[in-house]
Interface confidence: low
């Protein structure tokens, strides 16, 4: 009797199991009862990464540069390519199919952590008594300067986007 | 200003090979994309080849593929297309030119072939 | 490979008067982001060709505001509102979506 089912690495076609094409193959012929399944290697742009009956290999992805994407790993007759963003630009998502600039961090925020060719900038709130007065995608919150250290008394609060203003104390007047 | 003057082109019998080159000033060549561009007497402009800034990735023609290579020195601004087992047909003017790339609308965006040399005739005849 | 067609091919035109010129793709060039990745180049007589709009409908740098580039997907036209004299020459409409970039045959615009 034809079987039904296959064993792991076999598929079933005309009633009967054939050997399915190794990663990096694609299939030329299904086998028969007297001849091997046949299988041809992927040119040097395409890849199959699975034991597989496909007549085509798929294409490596093309990093674009237009995209502002970059290899990251070049793909095999196994593997993909790999894409990733270049520098001061990340994905717009996990398929990296675009990029987009590192967000800045607006004045009263700073960098939490810093932005890579994956993940986008994460921003902070400056706390009390640290601040930020620039957009930048990788300065942190600063501390406000102390006054006392360099015998002056603050003149000016310090916010979270700007710093204290340090004085002299005050003189006697004549 | 932004310039890209290119040369190497001649009278070249066919079978045999040329170099042309690209020369590049006043902007930062190591950032752009280039790409190789011709054109034959009375026709429309063919694209040729394109390498990417850091040479990484190349792309030829399918007209060209296997007889020319594109290639770049961003050390000395130049960029390169070595072109072996000419043609007749290969006969053209040759342009160098540059990808431009910009932010646009908060993207990281393609905006145009915006730089083109004033072009390298190659002629191929016997 | 994307076909680009062009037409007319041949675009008399009296100074003063519009002109327009379409680009038709063999496959779709608006990309996922939204954006048609489509330029349109002018090759004035004797000289290098160079950008007018990139994008389908952003004018390059420099580029007077008559030219005017429009459409999405596969159909698209450049526009010049009033020609000018130094307007005449070879305009040709690129592909920027995929390698190999293509053309289109070219279009001759002369004055009338």
């Known amino acids: 009797e034809p079987p039904t089912a296959c064993r792991e690495k076999q598929y079933l076609i005309n009633s009967q199991c054939c050997s399915l094409c190794q990663p990096g193959q694609k299939l030329v012929s299904d086998c028969t009862e007297f001849t091997e399944t046949e299988c041809l290697p992927c040119s040097e742009s395409e890849f199959l990464d699975t034991w597989n009956r496909e007549t085509r290999c798929h294409q490596h992805k093309y990093c674009d540069p237009n995209l502002g994407l970059q290899v990251q790993q070049k793909g095999t007759s196994e593997t993909d390519t790999i894409c990733t963003c270049e520098e001061g630009l990340h994905c717009t998502s996990e398929s990296c199919e675009s990029c987009v600039p590192h967000r800045s961090c607006l004045p009263g925020f700073g960098v939490k952590q810093i932005a890579t060719g994956v993940s986008d900038t994460i921003c902070e709130p400056c706390p009390v008594g640290f601040f930020s007065n620039v957009s930048s995608a990788f300065e942190k919150c600063r501390p406000w300067t102390s006054c006392e250290t360099k015998d002056l008394v603050v003149q000016q609060a310090g916010t979270n986007k700007t710093d204290v203003v340090c004085g002299p104390q005050d003189r006697q007047r004549a | 200003q932004v310039q890209l003057v290119e040369s190497g082109g001649g009278v070249v019998q066919p079978g045999r090979s040329l170099r042309l080159s690209c020369a590049a000033s006043?902007?930062?060549?190591?950032?752009?994309?280039m790409h190789w561009v011709r054109q034959a007497p009375g026709k429309g402009l063919e694209w040729v080849a394109v390498i990417s800034k850091d040479g990484g990735n190349k792309y030829h023609a399918d007209s060209v593929k296997g007889r020319f290579t594109i290639s770049r020195d961003n050390s000395k601004n130049a960029l390169y297309l070595q072109m072996n087992s000419l043609r007749v047909e290969d006969t053209a003017v040759y342009y160098c030119v540059r990808r431009g790339h910009q932010l646009v609308l908060g993207y990281y965006y393609y905006n145009g072939l915006d730089v083109w040399g004033q072009g390298t005739t190659v002629t191929v005849s016997s | 490979d994307i076909v680009l067609t062009q037409s007319p091919l041949s675009l008399p035109v009296t100074p003063g008067e519009p002109a327009s010129i379409s680009c038709r793709s063999s496959q779709s060039l608006l990309y996922s982001n939204g954006y048609n990745f489509l330029d349109w180049y002018l090759q004035k007589p004797g000289q290098s060709p160079q950008l007018l709009i990139y994008l389908g409908s952003n004018r390059a740098s420099g580029v007077p505001d008559r030219f005017s580039g429009s459409g999405s997907g596969t159909d698209f036209t450049l526009k010049i509102s009033r020609l000018e004299a130094e307007d005449v020459g070879v305009y040709y409409c690129?592909?920027?979506?995929?390698?190999?970039?293509?053309f289109g045959q070219g279009t001759k615009v002369e004055i009338k």
């Open positions: 006043g902007f930062t060549f190591s950032s752009y994309g």
């Open positions: 690129m592909q920027a979506l995929q390698t190999p970039r293509t």
